[in-house]
């Protein structure tokens, strides 16, 4: 695509409107103003929330933000390098309608010309909508999105980056000859060089998975990254996948087949941070199948979240979910077979007496 | 069932001394962390300490640290706080609570500690 | 101890939807659990985990989470919903638990 431009579509952009000026924000020319004149294709127009709490224009590749500390002018709040340091382009989704009355004004005359709106009775936050909804600015978040491989141990993407001078505000294959999509996980790759790919949700195993032809299930072994269970659920996520689940002996002898040769203690899907029962499968699968390690799980209000151990042959251990660790992602990709009839095996609430586990 | 039932809360001068006492059951208390949670009147909830299952290592907020202790007796299922050097600022209503996974999922109603002269 | 951020207040139109946000270095590791909270009350868990609900709680309320961000939306909100609400996690180690400073939901 040109230059900047984000090679996946943008589901988080929207437009600010105002119902007390009866207009659309605007970037321009460094500065900001309300414009009667919406228009959902003018990429002035066009804003979306980015890393750190910033909100990014895609008209001018720039952030939104005043000078340092909140001057309350409108001359202070315009359009400025998103890495420009001594200033503030932080904003908080619930208070930024409040901070653009304040700073915009709310005189209802000359409104589209920038810079020159005095300063009127404050409109309400609630006055400020997502165009065409009545959804407020915290509607459309930022979400963060975890790389694979590259050399950034699976941190997420930094938005914008600025990569051969340019600032992309998306996942880019720009500078990359095999297509693959990626982002710099620090503001400038050119000053940093860290960067990673980013996660796809396809329905094939091509890249960065492993397939076991006996059962099709696809499984991606995240070594150099280090993230918390969390975080490590929601890059499996973000592909379209879940932690690993094992649920039957097979299933431990290739995944252990493929820890051959390495030395690491890796999250799956085992957890149990949900009250309906005890341990239970990130995915829902039926745990049927058990390969904990002796005296494990243990720690039952500190240890909610399961490992496999290289140096106990593929056994299981619960961890604290906080710990930054690499994880193996799981995948069944969509079957055109007839569709298999359900499993006997299902997940039920457990009760147990006072003195047992479930 | 699980219950959690605080008791001990009252009235007390500035410098003095309490010690708070939350009865549980309906679950296996020797294999649990448990806190105190406390809300001063008007304000947020504020996490006060913990205890780890074996008693044998203890956390608490800075504000209350040389203050409040925290213990429990396993073979009661009752967790403690005692509490000496008491300020007006520790004038709260305190809970006993049992952290789930990641949570902290069960609470006492909690018991009343008016601190003043 | 990590800190978690929240509005103060928020109000809300009675059944139309508002969204509560907490913010927390501790919510990059640990998934944020919501109370509710009415006056001369105990918190109440009502959503916690990825998105889940413990038993007896509407299916009104819902959670989202990414990065250092987490979000109860309520969708339809009812009279009965107005009430302080705090999200809360564990911090690393689960050594000590981090509350946000509580939104007071006015449902109008």
């Known amino acids: 695509g040109a230059p900047g431009d984000a090679a996946l579509p943008e589901p988080n952009v929207f437009l600010i409107f105002s119902h007390g000026l009866q207009g659309c924000l605007e970037a321009q020319g460094g500065q900001v103003r309300v414009t009667p004149a919406c228009n959902t294709s003018l990429p002035a127009q066009r804003w979306k929330w980015v890393s750190r709490n910033r909100l990014f224009n895609l008209g001018t590749m720039q952030c939104l933000g005043t000078g340092w500390p909140g001057t309350n002018t409108t001359a202070s709040l315009g359009m400025y390098e998103c890495d420009r340091e001594a200033l503030n382009l932080r904003w908080h989704c619930r208070t930024l309608g409040d901070q653009l009355s304040l700073l915009l004004g709310a005189r209802t005359s000359n409104i589209s010309k920038p810079g020159t709106l005095e300063r009127g009775d404050q409109t309400r936050s609630g006055q400020w909508r997502i165009y065409g909804s009545e959804e407020d600015l915290c509607a459309l978040p930022y979400h963060e999105v975890y790389t694979i491989q590259g050399n950034s141990h699976g941190k997420p993407c930094t938005i914008p980056f600025k990569y051969d001078n340019q600032w992309f505000h998306g996942c880019t294959s720009t500078g990359r000859e095999d297509g693959h999509l990626w982002c710099a996980t620090t503001q400038d790759y050119g000053k940093d060089e860290r960067w990673g790919f980013c996660p796809i949700k396809s329905n094939d195993c091509e890249t960065f998975w492993d397939k076991d032809q006996l059962t099709d299930s696809c499984y991606q072994f995240n070594f150099q990254s280090t993230l918390s269970w969390r975080e490590a659920w929601a890059s499996c996520e973000q592909q379209g996948a879940d932690l690993l689940s094992i649920t039957e002996i097979h299933e431990q002898t290739y995944i252990n087949g493929l820890l051959t040769g390495y030395s690491s203690t890796l999250w799956i899907g085992l957890n149990d941070l949900d009250t309906s029962g005890g341990w239970q499968w990130s995915d829902n699968s039926p745990l049927k199948y058990l390969n904990w390690e002796s005296d494990q799980p243990d720690n039952p209000s500190e240890e909610n979240c399961g490992v496999i151990r290289t140096e106990s042959s593929g056994g299981w251990q619960n961890r604290d979910c906080s710990i930054a660790l690499p994880y193996v992602c799981k995948k069944k990709p969509n079957a055109t077979a007839e569709p298999t009839p359900p499993d006997r095996w299902a997940n039920v609430k457990v009760e147990c007496e006072p003195s047992w586990q479930p | 069932e699980v219950q959690l039932v605080e008791s001990g809360g009252g009235l007390v001068k500035p410098g003095g001394s309490l010690r708070l006492s939350c009865a549980a059951s309906?679950?296996?208390?020797?294999?649990?962390?448990m806190n105190w949670v406390r809300q001063a009147p008007g304000k947020g909830l504020e996490w006060v300490a913990n205890i780890k299952p074996n008693g044998n290592e203890r956390h608490s907020v800075e504000s209350v640290k040389g203050r409040f202790t925290i213990s429990r007796d396993n073979s009661k299922n009752s967790l403690y706080l005692q509490m000496n050097s008491l300020r007006a600022e520790d004038t709260a209503v305190y809970y006993c609570?049992?952290?789930?996974?990641?949570?902290?999922?069960?609470w006492g109603q909690g018991t009343l500690v008016t601190v003043s002269s | 101890s990590s800190e978690l951020t929240q509005d103060p207040a928020v109000s809300v139109a009675l059944g139309q939807t508002v969204r509560i946000t907490c913010q927390g270095d501790?919510?990059?590791?640990?998934?944020a659990s919501w109370y509710q909270q009415k006056p001369g009350q105990a918190p109440v868990l009502v959503v916690y985990?990825?998105?889940n609900r413990p038993s007896g709680i509407p299916d009104r309320f819902s959670g989202s989470s990414s990065g250092n961000t987490a979000s109860l939306t309520i969708t339809g909100a009812q009279a009965e919903d107005e009430a302080d609400y705090y999200c809360?996690?564990?911090?690393?180690?689960?050594?000590?638990?981090?509350f946000g400073g509580g939104t007071k939901v006015t449902v109008l």
């Open positions: 809360n996690s564990p911090n690393s180690g689960v050594i000590s638990w981090a």
């Open positions: 609570a049992r952290p789930g996974a990641g949570r902290l999922d069960y």
């Open positions: 501790s919510l990059r590791s640990y998934f």
């Open positions: 309906g679950f296996t208390f020797p294999s649990y962390a």
């Open positions: 985990f990825k998105n």
